[in-house]
Amino acid sequence: QNASRGRRQRRMHPNVSQGCQGGCATCSDYNGCLSCKPRLFFALERIGMKQIGVCLSSCPSGYYGTRYPDINKCTKCKADCDTCFNKNFCTKCKSGFYLHLGKCLDNCPEGLEANNHTMECVSIVHCEVSEWNPWSPCTKKGKTCGFKRGTETRVREIIQHPSAKGNLCPPTNETRKCTVQRKKCQKGERGKKGRERKRKKPNKGESKEAIPDSKSLESSKEIPEQRENKQQQKKRKVQDKQKSVSVSTVH
């Protein structure tokens, strides 16, 4: 970054000299570079109690450059600032500070949070989720026939993931028990799954399926064929009122 760093030669006249090293145009024994060759930046470097002039191809960290008509000059940023646009506006803070509106802060103001990657104060972003998608068909072991009680699921998408201090996302999956009018599986619907189920013995300690509340059971009573559509609509309304019984995904 600071490729050309001009310094004075030894055994040089203490006053202004033209026989300078590197990027210096003029220099002195005591002060180092006094002016620089074209396009180089002049900066004052503190060495002990003394300030020495140096000529650089660009301003070092903690300085900003101004291209005046007669000199390109490096000026120090504020103490807590690593890169700045000018004295008033920092663009990157030193380690341990967070940038907010051109200033370097120990802590981010209320309503903002620290982004430890960019080291800037950013707005807190809360989770946003879509509306629920419709409930899936009522199924049991992946099938929609040959049973009375099963489960149905619905999902929603995360539209906006939260930032570190943002509100967490609510569940994006919901499952609940459902009841259907028992119907026999048609040929081919039973398939492999049906045969496997017959052979499989229940696991030790496997609990019986929970029974939905009486309202759910009422709506599942077998009814004449012609009333099936109305009954299905009623059943949906009742089930939508029920609280979900299990939650499978939380973000």
Partner: antibody
């Protein structure tokens, strides 16, 4: 609160002189390069002159070089613009501003009208 | 001197509109670029510095982008108080130069 207050504007005949002043407060005046920027009626912004923080160097726009001089008194937090050989085209609102690459602080401006 | 070409010179828009003002610079200036807002009878006010960074107190509906020679000021949803004149300025080197200005008017 940063404040820059210009004064000294008015109506002046072509060829005459005028001196503008700018009183600064609310920031460390001696740390800043200070500038004058002008705006002719209904026109854009034009940089006029800048004097560096310690008063040791000054720079001027082509249209005023040789006619205008800029100075400052850091003990009084005051910036000056001496305008000589004024022309009709110097008619403008003159703003005093802290110049550090961008023009960060501005005064409310003072109107200079050059007319016979 | 570095030349600044700002467009459009004037623009009519309605509250809620998204507006864009552009500034083309005659040479590469990296991100040494500034936008100002000026209301009638008032001094200009610095809006954006270093091409994209908002000055304290400037609403987030304002944004700046660009680097090199092409720069843009965008107002995402115009508010009544945004009707003003906007100027760009290069801060890369002396002499500092400004764009001609864009007057944003109510449609």
């Amino acid at each position: 609160e940063v404040q820059l207050v210009e004064s000294g504007g008015g109506v002046v005949q072509p060829g005459r002189s005028l001196r503008l002043s700018c009183a600064a407060s609310g920031f460390t005046f001696s740390d800043y390069d200070m500038a004058w920027v002008r705006q002719a009626p209904g026109k854009g912004l034009e940089w006029v002159a800048t004097i560096i923080y310690d008063g040791s160097r000054a720079y001027f726009g082509d249209s005023v070089r040789g006619r205008f001089t800029v100075s400052r008194d850091n003990s009084k937090n005051t910036l000056y613009l001496q305008m000589n050989s004024l022309r009709a085209e110097d008619t403008a609102v003159y703003y005093c501003t802290a110049h550090d690459r961008s023009f960060d602080y501005w005064g409310q401006g003072t109107m200079v009208t050059v007319s016979s | 001197d570095i030349q600044m070409t700002q467009s459009p010179s004037s623009l009519s828009a309605s509250v809620g509109d998204r507006v864009t003002i552009t500034c083309l610079v005659s040479e590469d200036i990296s991100n040494d670029f500034v936008w100002y807002q000026q209301k009638p009878g008032k001094a200009p006010k610095l809006l954006i510095y270093a091409a994209s960074r908002l000055q304290d107190g400037v609403p987030s509906r304002f944004s700046g982008s660009g680097s090199g020679t092409d720069f843009t000021l965008t107002i995402s949803s115009l508010q009544p108080e945004d009707f003003a004149t906007y100027f760009c300025q290069q801060s890369y080197k002396y002499p500092p130069t400004f764009g001609q200005g864009t007057k944003l008017e109510i449609k």
